[in-house]
Interface confidence: medium
Amino acid sequence: FERTRSLQDPCSNCPAGTFCDNNRNQICSPCPPNSFSSAGGQRTCDICRQCKGVFRTRKECSSTSNAECDCTPGFHCLGAGCSMCEQDCKQGQELTKKGCKDCCFGTFNDQKRGICRPWTNCSLDGKSVLVNGTKERDVVCGPSPADLSPGASSVTPPAPAREPGHSPQ
C-alpha cells in the first residue's frame, strides 16, 4: 500500500513581517523597507501606502501593517480606509449621501461638520424672535412683550436645538 506523505509548504512557517524568498531557497526574509506582510506564509510583501497631497499619515507603515491615512484640515475621509478626501461642507450646509447640501429653511448649521438643526422655537419659552435665523445661525430669542419692563433682561441665549431624527414629510 502507498503511504500518504504530508507535504507541508515551507513558506507556511514564514511569519507576518517576512516573505518566503524563492530566490534564497524559500527561507523567510524580512520585508524590505516601505513594504509589509500582515499575514504569515506570503511570497511577497506589499508596498506600503503613501499618504501624499491632501492625505496625511495617521499611522506609519510597519513590517506587519500598512500605513493608514486621514485627511488634511478642511477635508474629511470618504470610502473604505479613507480612500478619498472630500472638502468639508461650509457653514449653512450638511453632508448627505449626495455630498454637501444647503440647510433648508428653518434649519441651520454653524459648523463645517455635522447636521442642519431646527431653529429654536422661541415661543415654546414664551419668548419672541429678536434676530431671525439663517442657514448659518440660529434665531436669537428675546423677551416676550410682557417682559419688556425696566430691569428686564433684553436677550436670552437660545435653548439648544435638537435634530428631530426623522425625515421631513
Epitope: 474629511h76 475621509c77 470618504l78 470610502g79 473604505a80 480606509g81 479613507c82 480612500s83 450638511e94 453632508l95 448627505t96 449621501k97 449626495k98 447640501k101 444647503d102 440647510c103 433648508c104 428653518g106 434649519t107 455635522g114 447636521i115 442642519c116 431646527p118 431624527g165 426623522h166 425625515s167 421631513p168 414629510q169
Partner: antibody, heavy 125, light 112 residues
Framework: QVQLQESGPGLVKPSETLSLTCKVS?????????MCWIRQPPGKGLEWIGC????????YYASWAKGRVTISVDSSKNQFSLKLSSVTAADTAVYYC?????????????????WGQGTLVTVSS | DIQMTQSPSSLSASVGDRVTITCQSS????????LAWYQQKPGKAPKLLIY???NLASGVPSRFSGSGSGTDFTLTISSLQPEDFATYYC????????????FGTGTKVTVL
C-alpha cells in the same frame, strides 16, 4: 399617519422566489433617500439586504445578496418590493422594510428612522 | 465584507446601573460618524436611539448617549430603567465603490 406595511406569502418552498411588497403611507417618494429591506432570522441579529434610491432608482445590495436579490419601486402605487431567488431554509426570517432618514434638504443620511412591523417568511417544503 | 462586532454579546444589569456597549467596525464608517444605535424588544421592529454617532433621536430619553469615531463607538445608558431591557444594535453606513450598510452583532441587556 406615516407608516410602512410589509405584505407577501408567509411560506415559500425551497428553490423558489420570495416576493414581498412594502406599502408606504403618509409620505411619498419625492426625495433622494433610500427605501431598504432588512431581515432577522429567528433568534438572530439584523441583516441588511439592500436599498433603492427613490430619486434615481439606483440599487445597493449586500454582497451575499448580489445576483439573488432585486429591489424595485413603483412610485405610482407608493410601494416598493423585494424579490429573493433560489431560497433555502437559511432565508427563513422576519423581513422588515425601512426608510432611510432624510436630511433637512431631503437627502439620505444613512440611518433608518421608520420601520415596518416585519413579516415572517418561512422557507419549507 | 464589513464586520461590526458588539461587545458584550449579552449582559445582566440592575435598574439604576450604568451600562456601556461597544461597537467595533472592520472599516471606518462614512465621514467617521455615520453610525446609529437601535433598541429592539421581542416581536417588535428596531427603534432608532442615536444617529451620527452622538445625536439623540426624537423622543429618546437623555439617559442614552453615544460617542466614538471612525471604527470604535460606544452606547451608554447612564441609569438603566425597567423599559431599557432589550437588545441593542449598532449600524454603520459605508462608501467604498458603492453605498453599503451593516448591523452589529447585537447586545442583549437582561435583568440581573
Amino acid at each position: 399617519q406615516v407608516q410602512l406595511q410589509e405584505s407577501g406569502p408567509g411560506l415559500v418552498k425551497p428553490s423558489e422566489t420570495l416576493s414581498l411588497t412594502c406599502k408606504v403611507s403618509g409620505f411619498s417618494f419625492n426625495n433622494d433617500y433610500d427605501m431598504c429591506w432588512i431581515r432577522q432570522p429567528p433568534g438572530k441579529g439584523l441583516e441588511w439586504i439592500g436599498c433603492i434610491d427613490t430619486g434615481d432608482g439606483s440599487t445597493y445590495y449586500a454582497s451575499w445578496a448580489k445576483g439573488r436579490v432585486t429591489i424595485s419601486v413603483d412610485s405610482s402605487k407608493n410601494q416598493f418590493s423585494l424579490k429573493l431567488s433560489s431560497v433555502t431554509a437559511a432565508d427563513t426570517a422576519v423581513y422588515y422594510c425601512a426608510r432611510e432618514a432624510a436630511s433637512s434638504s431631503g437627502y439620505g443620511m444613512g440611518y433608518f428612522d421608520l420601520w415596518g412591523q416585519g413579516t415572517l417568511v418561512t422557507v419549507s417544503s | 465584507d464589513i464586520q461590526m462586532t458588539q461587545s458584550p454579546s449579552s449582559l445582566s444589569a440592575s435598574v439604576g446601573d450604568r451600562v456601556t456597549i461597544t461597537c467595533q467596525s472592520s472599516q471606518s464608517v462614512y465621514d467617521n460618524n455615520w453610525l446609529a444605535w437601535y433598541q429592539q424588544k421581542p416581536g417588535k421592529a428596531p427603534k432608532l436611539l442615536i444617529y451620527r454617532a452622538s445625536n439623540l433621536a426624537s423622543g429618546v430619553p437623555s439617559r442614552f448617549s453615544g460617542s466614538g469615531s471612525g471604527t470604535d463607538f460606544t452606547l451608554t445608558i447612564s441609569s438603566l430603567q425597567p423599559e431599557d431591557f432589550a437588545t441593542y444594535y449598532c449600524q454603520g453606513t459605508y462608501l467604498s465603490s458603492n453605498w453599503y450598510w451593516a448591523f452589529g452583532t447585537g447586545t442583549k441587556v437582561t435583568v440581573l
